[in-house]
Interface confidence: low
């Protein structure tokens, strides 16, 4: 499969663009909006009918080094009585994000962009019924 | 990838911090090339807190297309297919990293940007605010 390239040929290169070696790009990892703090509707992960837990994965050779992943707590969904209803399904909702991967090669280091699939939370869905012939 | 020589002496101690600016390969390593959530699953329609997906396009950003979820109802869909307002559909939001062309319009110069996207919706028991 062809790996997608980030550069777009339809962009006219302005004179002010920094010189970049062929096959690479310059990346400033000082994050825009770095200090924006986010809080979803309070305790959404435990109030949901498809509740989930969070785990933090940590990798010193990844930027950002911390990535939080959600895992659905149940196969079914929680009904009004607080019991699991297995006629419904808790399913993960996922989103891609970019990370920078640092690779050591002898005394050299290289950097590679990587897409990571993050599980953000869970939602309750009506299952798809497969009828057996 | 593009290799960058380390400090002379190549110390054993691990660099704790990433440099502020790095040169990275133009190719992105990924196994998840399907960025249209409508194709990847129909959860947005089957959920008890269904959502619509809106296309957000920005050529100065990579990826240039991001899909934003908007919950269809304030309540959730019950077993009869009706909206139950004793429950709330709320968006699940996530901060993601994207690339922003910097300076603008430059083909191979980027800065990481953190943006907030609504990925989908989930059905929650409401927080009841008791009016005094």
């Amino acid at each position: 499969r062809k790996i997608p390239k980030v550069g777009h040929t339809f962009f006219q290169k302005p004179e002010s663009c920094p010189p970049v070696p062929g096959g690479s790009m310059k990346l400033d990892i000082g994050i825009i909006n770095e200090n924006q703090r986010v809080s979803m509707s309070r305790n959404i992960e435990s109030r949901s009918t498809s509740p989930w837990n969070y785990t933090v994965t940590w990798d010193p050779n990844r930027y950002p080094s911390e990535v939080v992943q959600a895992q659905c707590r149940n196969l079914g969904c929680i009904n009004a009585q607080g019991k699991e209803d297995i006629s419904m399904n808790s399913v993960p909702i996922q989103q891609e994000t970019l990370v920078v991967r640092r690779k050591h090669q002898g005394c050299s280091v290289s950097f590679q962009l990587e897409k990571v699939l993050v599980t953000v939370g869970c939602t309750c869905v009506t299952p798809v019924i497969h009828h057996v012939q | 990838g593009i290799t960058i020589p380390r400090n002379p002496g190549c110390p054993n101690s691990e660099d704790k911090n990433f440099p502020r600016t790095v040169m990275v390969n133009l190719n992105i390593h990924n196994r998840n090339t399907n960025t249209n959530p409508k194709r990847s699953s129909d959860y947005y329609n089957r959920s008890t807190s269904p959502w619509n997906l809106h296309r957000n396009e920005d050529p100065e950003r990579y990826p240039s297309v991001i899909w934003e979820a908007k919950c269809r109802h304030l309540g959730c869909i019950n077993a009869d297919g009706n909206v139950d307002y004793h429950m709330n559909s709320v968006p699940i939001q996530q901060e993601i990293l994207v690339l922003r062309r910097e300076p603008p319009h430059c083909p191979n110069s980027f800065r990481l940007e953190k943006i907030l996207v609504s990925v989908g919706c989930t059905c929650v028991t409401p927080i009841v605010h008791h009016v005094a």
Epitope: Q36, R37, V38, S39, M40, S41, R42 | N52, H54, K70, C71, R72, H73, L74, N88, V90, P91, Q93, L116, S118, P126, I127, H129
Partner: nanobody, 124 residues
């Protein structure tokens, strides 16, 4: 923080019309949903109408064809045009909104907010 302020309630004769308005103010980033609920004396609060960020609307069966909800996004305001009013429409009407907002440097993506209510009395 976020405040919802309603106006437009009052006394009206059966068959008459009223227009309610509700404006959201504060450190608002986006409004997902705005709408109206009502509570008649001795009854539970019930949905009247909701309007979503995309412009689609939900109505209670009892008001369909008589009430129209609309929204002015530039003013963070929602309106409820009530025509052909009946005695059973008498209630305190509450504005409700699901809002993403900033407070103390933290972004809250989705919280339900309520107005203080405006009384609508339909009587001859």
């Amino acid at each position: 923080e976020v405040q919802l302020v309603e106006s437009g309630g009052g006394l009206v004769q059966p068959g008459g019309s009223l227009r309610l308005s509700c404006t959201a103010s504060g450190t608002i980033v986006n409004i997902h949903v705005m709408g109206w609920y009502r509570q008649a004396p001795g009854k539970q609060r019930e949905l009247v109408a909701l309007i979503f960020s995309g412009g689609s609307a939900d109505y209670a069966d009892s008001v369909k064809g008589r009430f129209t909800i609309s929204r002015d996004n530039s003013k963070n305001t929602v309106y409820l045009q009530m025509n052909s009013l009946r005695a059973e429409d008498t209630a305190v009407y509450y504005c409700a909104a699901e809002i993403g907002y900033y407070s103390g440097g933290t972004y809250y993506s989705s919280e339900a907010h309520w107005g203080q209510g405006t009384l609508v009395t339909v009587s001859s």
